[in-house]
Interface confidence: medium
Amino acid sequence: AYRPSETLCGGELVDTLQFVCGDRGFYFSRPASRVSRRSRGIVEECCFRSCDLALLETYCATPAKSERDVSTPPTVLPDNFPRYPVGKFFQYDTWKQSTQRLRR
């Protein structure tokens, strides 16, 4: 399969995750016990395929309005990815463009 044109990769993926997840932080992969297709990780889901905001939200470290699964801490991220957002460095326009793309 070829990668679709509307995808999120690299820094844009991190930026968008930070925008979507806010202070909750995020995972780059999900425990296999969760929905099985998520075990591929967000890179495969969003960089190599199109993903939407709802899917991005599933990679946030704490579910927005449901109980947190404390038995599975966030996956250790590569150290070139910020684990949590650094609010004052946000480039809101970039993330707004990315999330608008995902809504389309």
């Epitope: 399969a1 070829y2 990769c9 690299g10 844009e12 890179v43 495969e44 960089c47 070139n80």
Partner: antibody
Framework: EVQLLESGGGLVQPGGSLRLSCAAS???????VMWWVRQAPGKGLEWVS?????????VYADSVKGRFTISRDNSKNTLYLQMNSLRAEDTAVYYC????????????WGQGTLVTVSS | DIQMTQSPSTLSASVGDRVTITCRAS??????LAWYQQKPGKAPKLMIY???SLGSEVPSRFSGSGSGTEFTLTISSLQPEDFSTYYC?????????FGQGTRLEIK
Amino acid sequence: EVQLLESGGGLVQPGGSLRLSCAASGFTFSEYVMWWVRQAPGKGLEWVSVISPSGGYTVYADSVKGRFTISRDNSKNTLYLQMNSLRAEDTAVYYCARDRGGATTLDYWGQGTLVTVSS
Amino acid sequence: DIQMTQSPSTLSASVGDRVTITCRASQTISSWLAWYQQKPGKAPKLMIYKAASLGSEVPSRFSGSGSGTEFTLTISSLQPEDFSTYYCQQYKTYPVTFGQGTRLEIK
């Protein structure tokens, strides 16, 4: 220790084919995005192709699209690059490299294998 | 695609010198920039990522700075083993792109 070892390079005539392999060890191969990057003699780095961890998704540079095919066998910890319809401008050292975090930076590279396209 | 332009193409310096290499992006890439070092006949080595973070086992004399469209790699006191070619790479999004390289040679 992470190791990437390319093989399969050599001399081929224009229009010919070659298949490069990259044997990976020292890490969980199936979890990483993998790349092929090339470097023509005396020139800079050019990314060629990228493949997702599962092998289900691929990306190609415009210069090789339709001629090269990247693939992987996670059971064998091996990355491949099938090169068809080779041209003189494909002459380069071809490196396989591990993506550090997903469409980002390349933290481990193989030693490279030279592909020479000439009549 | 985002174009990356390095300057200078060649830089002559002496052991102990402080040197700076510049990389410019054709559009803003935030801090999503890496620097690689390549010695003749060898594979590139990741030196700096996220514009300013030091790669694994990279000496502290190397540093990176910048954001947006302009970035610099600085070597505070050149050592003999630092004479190499350096490449910048943006990874804000696909396709990632490399600069054309800066060759650091002995004066």
